[in-house]
Interface confidence: medium
């Protein structure tokens, strides 16, 4: 005869475990049904009655088969510096990610809780390390022979153009000015940009010198004026 299929709740054989989508209830000492994603256990099982499941209320969810008494709360609404990449449903949590030009200062397992604007390097400073989803831009002073005349989170230091005759020598924040109609060779035809990151947080290691010794990170940022650029004057 084929083995009889046990219906929940049932007492497991000694040494055996409950089946998939079932759990062992310590109080009832029975194998009982789990609740499906989007539901939670309203009434726990007994020796004679199975788990009673109920749908998650608004703004709550369960992502897995479970026997939790209450659904989990969805995260707070995404702020103005964030994009909602996954909505809160009965089966999944809301996921917020940082907008372009921002990075995650306080990350969650999925998405981001608190975003911060990427640091902008002032004239005389270029990007030493570009921002990423989880790290801020690192600025460095432009070395002799290079310059940056922009306030940017993507521009690196560029070489001065080489002149036949120099009218005005270049410095860290300005290109050289040539007296002749055109330089013999321009090593800097245009601004060099680094790719813009999607979102994230600051690294707490400083591989290159920068005007501020610690990275700028922050909590939930409302939209507003951009923070000042990082640069030679400091604070």
């Amino acid at each position: 005869l084929p083995a009889q299929v046990a219906f929940t709740p049932y007492a497991p054989e000694p040494g055996s475990t409950c089946r998939l989508r079932e759990y062992y209830d310590q109080t009832a000492q029975m194998c009982c049904s789990k609740c499906s994603p989007g539901q939670h256990a309203k009434v726990f099982c007994t020796k004679t009655s199975d788990t009673v499941c109920d749908s998650c209320e608004d703004s709550t969810y369960t992502q897995l088969w479970n026997w939790v008494p209450e659904c989990l709360s969805c995260g707070s609404r995404c702020s103005s510096d964030q994009v909602e990449t996954q909505a809160c449903t009965r089966e999944q949590n809301r996921i917020c990610t940082c907008r372009p030009g921002w990075y995650c200062a306080l990350s969650k397992q999925e998405g981001c809780r608190l975003c911060a604007p990427l640091r902008k390097c002032r004239p005389g400073f270029g990007v030493a390390r570009p921002g990423t989803e989880t790290s801020d831009v690192v600025c460095k002073p432009c070395a002799p022979g290079t310059f940056s005349n922009t306030t940017s989170s993507t521009d690196i230091c560029r070489p001065h153009q080489i002149c036949n005759v120099v009218a005005i020598p270049g410095n860290a924040s300005m290109d050289a000015v040539c007296t002749s109609t055109s330089p013999t060779r321009s090593m800097a035809p245009g601004a060099v940009h680094l790719p813009q990151p999607v979102s994230t947080r600051s690294q707490h290691t400083q591989p290159t010198p920068e005007p501020s010794t610690a990275p700028s990170t922050s909590f939930l940022l409302p939209m507003g004026p951009s923070p000042p650029a990082e640069g030679s004057t400091g604070d």
């Epitope: 200062a105 306080l106 969650k108 610690a214 990170t217 922050s218 923070p227």
Partner: antibody, heavy 115, light 111 residues
Framework: EVQLLESGGGLVQPGGSLRLSCAAS????????MSWVRQAPGKGLEWVAL????????YYADSVKGRFTISRDNSKNTLYLQMNSLRAEDTAVYYC????????WGQGTLVTVSS | QSVLTQPPSASGTPGQRVTISCTGR?????????VHWYQQLPGTAPKLLIY???KRPSGVPDRFSGSKSGTSASLAISGLRSEDEADYYC???????????FGGGTKLTVL
């Protein structure tokens, strides 16, 4: 180098007020979120309050809500904590700290609430 | 009562490996927030020791390491030295309190 220097601590009677200051240097103060964290004598660390980089939003621990006010003056690179209706249990060393990670701390200023 | 739970004390002899635990709940560590660790030497301000569960700021020796699993985290110190004698605190963001929370601290004694 990041530097945070607290001041304004001292002895105050229960029910009294005190204003703490934190002078910041070595980083772009106006683009960083700042917090106050306190430590009662012989006890652990307790977060007190947090302020946005532009001062537009503030968070407070339940224990100080309605009594303490965090503020900042970005033109002076200074963070403040106005403490009103002080209680004996507010006695602590108060630190200002930058960043959600508290990656830099001041040396602290002692506030003693006692009659 | 702290939101994050740490053992009040831990000890070890020089050269030994010591682990300090930090247990949270579904609104903080279990919600997916990173855990950060701070070292407070006697009479000084706290210092960031480990961030984002397992990353070290520049200048922190690789004897210090961190890990996180589920609703708990731990700090491990290998090759224990006398200068490691300090208070150690864990911290994480908490959704229900809408702010960061600390553990009660663990006093590490080097015997």
């Amino acid at each position: 180098e990041v530097q945070l220097l607290e001041s304004g601590g001292g002895l105050v009677q229960p029910g009294g007020s005190l204003r703490l200051s934190c002078a910041a240097s070595g980083f772009t103060f106006s683009s960083n979120y700042m917090s106050w964290v306190r430590q009662a004598p012989g006890k652990g660390l307790e977060w007190v309050a947090l302020i946005w980089y532009d001062g537009s939003n503030k968070y407070y621990a339940d224990s100080v809500k309605g009594r303490f006010t965090i503020s900042r003056d970005n033109s002076k690179n200074t963070l403040y904590l106005q403490m009103n209706s002080l209680r004996a249990e507010d006695t602590a060393v108060y630190y200002c700290a930058k960043d959600p990670l508290f990656d830099s701390w001041g040396q602290g200023t002692l506030v003693t609430v006692s009659s | 009562q702290s939101v994050l739970t740490q053992p009040p004390s831990a000890s070890g002899t020089p050269g030994q490996r010591v682990t300090i635990s930090c247990t949270g709940r579904s609104s903080n560590i279990g919600a997916g927030y990173d855990v950060h660790w701070y070292q407070q030497l006697p009479g000084t301000a706290p210092k960031l020791l480990i961030y984002d569960n397992n990353k070290r700021p520049s200048g922190v020796p690789d004897r210090f390491s961190g890990s996180k699993s589920g609703t708990s985290a731990s700090l491990a110190i290998s090759g224990l030295r006398s200068e490691d004698e300090a208070d150690y605190y864990c911290a994480a963001w908490d959704d229900s309190l809408n702010g960061p929370v600390f553990g009660g601290g663990t006093k590490l004694t080097v015997l």
